[in-house]
Amino acid sequence: MMTGTIETTGNISAEKGGSIILQCHLSSTTAQVTQVNWEQQDQLLAICNADLGWHISPSFKDRVAPGPGLGLTLQSLTVNDTGEYFCIYHTYPDGTYTGRIFLEVLESSVAEHGARFQIP
């Protein structure tokens, strides 16, 4: 039975040209995390594997950095980066947990972070 929950940074906004940290937090489970995938819609951004470390997708290689922790830092934001991002936690023995973050990249200088929320 999957008892865990994923908390994410929720709905967030950032300025064009700036950077943003995407973070998810898995809690309420003793399952071992073996890999975390970060995806934008259907496109893979990065993989963090417990044995092999990080792999950043070539199309994001110049502006994505690992961390903090299992999170991801996305730099040099463009309006095209607006959209849904998913953290996919592969765990044993529970299986897969998925968290969703919506990022809006704004042209203006006013970009406020949304509140945190939980995805069971």
Partner: antibody, heavy 116, light 107 residues
Framework: QAYLQQSGAELVRSGASVKMSCKAS????????MHWVKQTPGQGLEWIGC????????NYNQKFKGKATLTADTSSSTAYMQISSLTSEDSAVYFC?????????WGQGTLVTVSA | DIVMTQSQKFMSTSVGDRVSVTCKAS??????VAWYQQKPGQSPKTLIY???YRYSGVPDRFTGSGSGTDFTLTISNVQSEDLAEYFC?????????FGGGTKLEIK
């Protein structure tokens, strides 16, 4: 088996710069961030910053911006840290540490002593 | 910056005992906490990551627990080789920060 070999102890004059190295072996250098940590008896452990060798993106502790510069050479699997305008406060042991999201592996440390 | 407080600078224990080292974060760091062991003249070694997961090769007498702001490293059946200083660290947000350390003394 991952291994980090740090360069030897340095005795440097106040006002000068020092560049230390951290040579990685036993793993894919570009798949892990390299962090740098300062240790002194007075201040304990302080995180200086990190570099991801896959694209050389860096992240610095604001306290060490302008003081430390992190670089990486993927051809030799070596990370470097330069510390500039040295003062007695920079006398410390400096560690490099590999981080891949699932725990950290530390180098043996480089002792830097700043003399007047 | 997030402050990690290890209120006990020294702890005294005997071989075979169980001891708990505590660490408190100034704000919620979820489970993004690691514990390190450092013996005199050596570099730190990772014991625990993600608050409760044992790092490769670490004996199972070392156990981590906690989430949010309160974290504990428990050493059961203390051995003489556990004489060392223990540090917590948060890696939830930059800059990463460390606790001041707790020195374990063996009676």
């Amino acid at each position: 088996q991952a291994y980090l070999q740090q360069s030897g102890a340095e005795l440097v004059r106040s006002g000068a710069s020092v560049k230390m190295s951290c040579k990685a072996s036993g793993y894919t250098f570009t798949s892990y961030s390299m962090h740098w940590v300062k240790q002194t008896p007075g201040q304990g452990l302080e995180w200086i910053g990190c570099i991801y060798p896959g694209n050389v993106i860096t992240n610095y502790n604001q306290k060490f911006k302008g003081k430390a510069t992190l670089t990486a050479d993927t051809s030799s699997s070596t990370a470097y840290m330069q510390i500039s305008s040295l003062t007695s406060e920079d006398s410390a042991v400096y560690f490099c540490a590999r981080d891949g999201g699932f725990g950290t592996y530390w180098g043996q440390g480089t002792l830097v002593t700043v003399s007047a | 910056d997030i402050v990690m407080t290890q209120s006990q600078k020294f702890m005294s224990t005997s071989v075979g005992d169980r001891v708990s080292v505590t660490c408190k974060a100034s704000q919620n760091v979820h489970t993004n906490v690691a514990w390190y062991q450092q013996k005199p003249g050596q570099s730190p070694k990772t014991l625990i990551y993600s608050a409760s997961y044992r790092y490769s090769g670490v004996p199972d007498r070392f156990t981590g627990s906690g989430s949010g702001t309160d974290f504990t490293l428990t050493i059961s059946n203390v051995q003489s080789e556990d004489l060392a200083e223990y540090f917590c660290q948060q890696y939830n947000s930059y800059p990463y920060t460390f606790g001041g350390g707790t020195k374990l003394e063996i009676k």
